[in-house]
């Protein structure tokens, strides 16, 4: 299975986090845990996070790493679009954005990534084990889809990591290659979690000589001196299925875009917008299949030109995204 995971950024230690969460050996398990719950193609990454302050609020971020220009993005939940999933938002680079409850705000973050905020309560509220999928249609190559969900538990005593369901269009090489990596990773995760459970976590000062440091850096390329992992996930162990939304779905021809205001698509256009402005660092992505450990602030080697952020009226801090350094 081809797998793409958005890795939480390493953060400076926070008060109260020097214990188990501050323990360096937990960096790798958390990264592996994220890998175990996000599946798709190496062209697309999906990150799902729940706001710790509002347990009913989710942020889904998706990005496209493939070649070509994006012609349409569809975000769905409950499974891949067209395979039982329910459409939450459709983003078109020129015609604008359309969204359906409980989607609150869908927007382009860069030329090749989007974010969607979900909130709600009751039947249409998302829950922790919901699968969210992003499908990017690119020109001329066509569609790529990947799905992700929240880790089912942030408890260090997690009994077993989940197994991601295969995503459409994952080729045999991808399945074999990444299955091996995931199997090794998940087994190693269990081993570390069990070992950690049976001994108290020492309060370690950040140390460059820690034997876990190189591995932590390999999986989550950030500053080596940063010791604690700030996990941006709150979890709830409920089991639910998204309700069928009683709103219109986009189908047919282009006519359903007609009611959109002309300013709806906040996406830089034209060759100038594709200049060499780099993406600000937003944590890191891991492409298992490609063996690629690249900082999000660097241009992935197989993408096209550099990417440009949209201007945001709330100022530069607003553009940092869920994984920005706070």
């Amino acid at each position: 299975m081809r797998t793409e995971a958005q890795v939480p950024a390493l953060q400076p230690p926070e008060p109260g986090l020097e214990g188990a969460m501050g323990h360096r050996t937990l960096v790798l398990p958390w990264v592996l845990l994220t890998l175990c719950v996000t599946a798709g193609t190496p062209e697309v990454w999906v990150q799902v996070r729940m706001e710790a302050t509002e347990l009913s609020s989710f942020t889904i971020r998706c990005g496209f790493l493939g070649s070509g220009s994006i012609s349409l993005v569809t975000v769905s939940w409950g499974g891949p679009n067209g395979a039982g999933g329910t459409t939450l938002a459709v983003l078109h680079p020129e015609r604008g954005i359309r969204q359906w409850a409980p989607a609150r705000q869908a927007r382009w973050e860069t030329q090749s990534s989007i974010s969607l905020i979900l909130e709600g309560s009751g039947a249409s509220s998302p829950c922790a084990n919901t699968t969210f999928c992003c499908k990017f249609a690119s020109f001329p190559e066509g569609s790529w889809e990947a799905c992700g969900s929240l880790p089912p538990s942030s408890d260090p005593g997690l009994s077993a990591p989940p197994t991601p369901a295969p995503i459409l269009r994952a080729d045999l090489a991808g399945i074999l290659g990444v299955s091996g990596v995931l199997l090794f990773g998940c087994v190693y995760l269990l081993h570390l979690l069990r070992r950690h459970k049976h001994r108290p976590a020492p309060r370690l000062q950040p140390s460059r000589t820690s034997p876990q440091a190189p591995r932590a850096r390999a999986w989550a390329p950030s500053q080596a001196s940063q010791a604690a992992l700030h996990v941006p996930y709150a979890t709830i162990n409920t089991s639910c299925r998204p309700a069928t939304l009683d709103t219109a779905h986009p189908h047919g021809g282009p006519s359903w875009w007609a009611s959109l205001p002309t300013h709806a698509a906040h996406r830089p256009q034209g060759p100038a917008a594709w200049a060499s402005t780099p993406i600000p660092a937003r944590g890191s992505f891991v492409s298992v299949e490609n063996g690629l450990y690249a900082q999000a602030g660097e241009r992935p080697p197989h993408t096209g030109p550099g990417l440009t952020l949209f201007p945001d009226p709330r100022g530069p801090r607003a553009m940092e995204g869920p994984l920005g350094v706070r």
């Epitope: 070649s67 070509g68 349409l72 249609a137 020109f139 001329p140 066509g142 569609s143 080729d171 875009w257």
Partner: antibody, heavy 116, light 106 residues
């Protein structure tokens, strides 16, 4: 196996219009662009345009904009190209093609002969 | 529009010989794609994104280049490689093809 089946040979008069088809099978038709490419006898390839069946998005080369019209029928997984105001310069083989995750699939080509 | 000039227009090579053909763009492009076409058949994309081989293409083929200069190389010519090769850019509409290089076997 992915297949693109194109309509057969077409003979047309100068000034007339023709509509050729490209029927897709064994993949999700709506998810991938259908490209149209022209090849005159003994010559190179020329991109005409493309359509994204999911929402009807089209892209054309300026040379064919206004004279070629691309459409797609999702119910029959068929893409169409209509060319108006034919001249002898339009005599060529017209291919439809699609790229599915970096693998390309081509129709066998429709031969259009424009002659009075 | 971006004009792609392929050279040579025609070339021949003996089995086992190394073959290199070039594609020169009138202005810079991010990537070049190469297509193989044999007489009487539809083209097939052979190399995409400058260097990546389409599934099923023999490893003796390789692509390289950047900016305005690109090339396709066959490390060891085989009879089945005799065909016409076209380069193409998906960078700027119109998405142009080169005029082709016809490769013959000696």
């Amino acid at each position: 196996q992915v297949q693109l089946q194109q309509s057969g040979t077409i003979l047309a008069r100068p000034g007339a219009s023709v509509k050729m088809s490209c029927r897709a099978s064994d993949y999700t038709f709506t998810d991938y662009w259908i490209q149209w490419i022209k090849q005159r006898p003994g010559q190179g390839l020329e991109w005409i345009g493309a359509i994204f069946p999911e929402n009807g998005d089209t892209r054309y080369t300026q040379k064919f904009k206004g004279r070629a019209t691309l459409t797609a029928d999702k119910s029959s997984s068929t893409a169409y190209m209509q060319v108006n105001s034919l001249t002898s310069e339009d005599s060529a083989v017209y291919y439809c093609a699609t790229f599915i995750n970096y693998v390309d699939y081509w129709g066998q080509g429709t031969t259009l002969t424009v002659s009075s | 529009q971006i004009v792609l000039i392929q050279s040579p227009a025609i070339m021949s090579a003996s089995p086992g010989e190394k073959v290199t053909m070039t594609c020169s763009a009138s202005s810079s492009v991010n990537n070049i794609h190469w297509y193989q076409q044999k007489s009487g058949t539809s083209p097939k994309r052979w190399i995409y994104d400058t260097t990546k081989l389409t599934s099923g293409v023999p490893a003796r083929f390789s692509g390289s280049g950047s900016g305005t200069s690109y090339s396709l190389t066959i490390s060891s010519m085989e009879a089945e490689d005799a065909a016409t090769y076209y380069c193409q850019q998906w960078n700027i509409n119109p998405y142009t093809f080169g005029g082709g290089t016809k490769l013959e076997i000696k």
